[in-house]
Amino acid sequence: RLSSKSVNAQVTDINSKGLELRKTVTTVETQNLEGLHHDGQFCHKPCPPGERKARDCTVNGDEPDCVPCQEGKEYTDKAHFSSKCRRCRLCDEGHGLEVEINCTRTQNTKCRCKPNFFCNSTVCEHCDPCTKCEHGIIKECTLTSNTKCKEEGSRSN
């Protein structure tokens, strides 16, 4: 399986959200910072963020070139040895989300709540619709908190 160890500060674990068609990593030597061992194949140089290996590294030391990830569909935000980029997140409108920042080759999509939706957790995977008040509003709905409604029969000063 893909190792959960990081090789060094610049080269991170590639077992990440949406990483496509990855080669299984069988061994990772944390002392060995020159490369990564893939099924008897050895990569010496990682690809920078936004790029991937054009193909898997070979046992004879042939080092594939790095090629760009597909803009708007894939990304890698760290240096890595994989021949595939990660899949960009979709901001699912069915979960009350919309795109805040589009996916680039080096950064995953950033989502936010759609208008009239809110989310009160730190990481928003789902936003809920703001409550509609029948008897008036105490506090408007924001991106991070629901509407506060007046109770029936309450007076406004």
């Epitope: 399986r1 990440s16 959200k17 949406g18 979709l90 699912d92």
Partner: antibody, heavy 121, light 111 residues
Framework: QVQLVQSGAEVKKPGASVKVSCKAS????????MQWVKQAPGQGLEWMGE????????NYNQKFKGKATLTVDTSTSTAYMELSSLRSEDTAVYYC??????????????WGQGTLVTVSS | DIVLTQSPSSLSASVGDRVTITCKAS??????????MNWYQQKPGKAPKLLIY???NLESGVPSRFSGSGSGTDFTLTISSLQPEDFATYYC?????????FGQGTKVEIK
């Protein structure tokens, strides 16, 4: 309500091609990727590939590259899956399914009723 | 490819029984605390139906007797009290890595 309606069963000869349609309704077609899944008789489910209807970007399971071609017609909210050079092992029920994303976990929430493709000489 | 192995392949149970189906992945389908595992139900001649997404989230409209749990390589679908309409085949599916793969299915039959 959200619905995916697929075209009817097809019987084809080996070597022929077939195009299965999947008409979406009840949601914004271009907002959700469409997935395609194969189920051979008495067998399990096999993911074939996906298409983003907003720009026709496709991503295939390597096993189906060259076998399946995914397209969309946004004017009619219809997705298509064409199978070429048909062989007996392509005999299966083919499903389209709407893709959803929960923090990069992609899953299939609404499925078409399936289209049986039979390849027989 | 990630191989998903479901167990048992089939089981016989009675209405009211608690049923547990397991799905074991050949490598972890987790990242950053999230598990990329989904569960579907399929009845003969019908399309699959989503039950659980992201390991433990119940799909809207699915009865609360269905629940999902697990992380890493080991996942479980539980039906707390089996109902007549629950006799079907159940599939797990991972979306952490392409190609997305399904388990071979678990057939739940009437005892």
């Amino acid at each position: 309500q959200v619905q995916l309606v697929q075209s009817g069963a097809e019987v084809k000869k080996p070597g022929a091609s077939v195009k299965v349609s999947c008409k979406a309704s009840g949601y914004t077609f271009t907002s959700y990727w469409m997935q395609w899944v194969k189920q051979a008789p008495g067998q399990g489910l096999e993911w074939m590939g996906e298409i983003d209807p907003s720009d026709s970007y496709t991503n295939y399971n390597q096993k189906f590259k060259g076998k399946a071609t995914l397209t969309v017609d946004t004017s009619t909210s219809t997705a298509y899956m064409e199978l070429s050079s048909l062989r007996s092992e392509d005999t299966a029920v083919y499903y389209c399914a709407r893709n959803r994303d929960y923090s990069n976990n992609w899953y299939f929430d609404v499925w078409g009723q399936g289209t049986l493709v039979t390849v027989s000489s | 490819d990630i191989v998903l192995t479901q167990s048992p392949s089939s089981l016989s149970a009675s209405v009211g029984d608690r049923v547990t189906i397991t799905c074991k992945a050949s490598q972890s389908v987790d990242y950053d605390g999230d598990s990329y595992m989904n569960w579907y139900q399929q009845k003969p001649g019908k399309a699959p139906k989503l039950l659980i997404y992201a390991a433990s989230n119940l799909e809207s409209g699915v009865p609360s007797r269905f629940s999902g749990s697990g992380s890493g390589t080991d996942f479980t679908l539980t039906i707390s009290s089996l109902q007549p309409e629950d006799f079907a085949t159940y599939y797990c599916q991972q979306s952490n890595e392409d190609p997305r793969t399904f388990g071979q299915g678990t057939k739940v039959e009437i005892k």
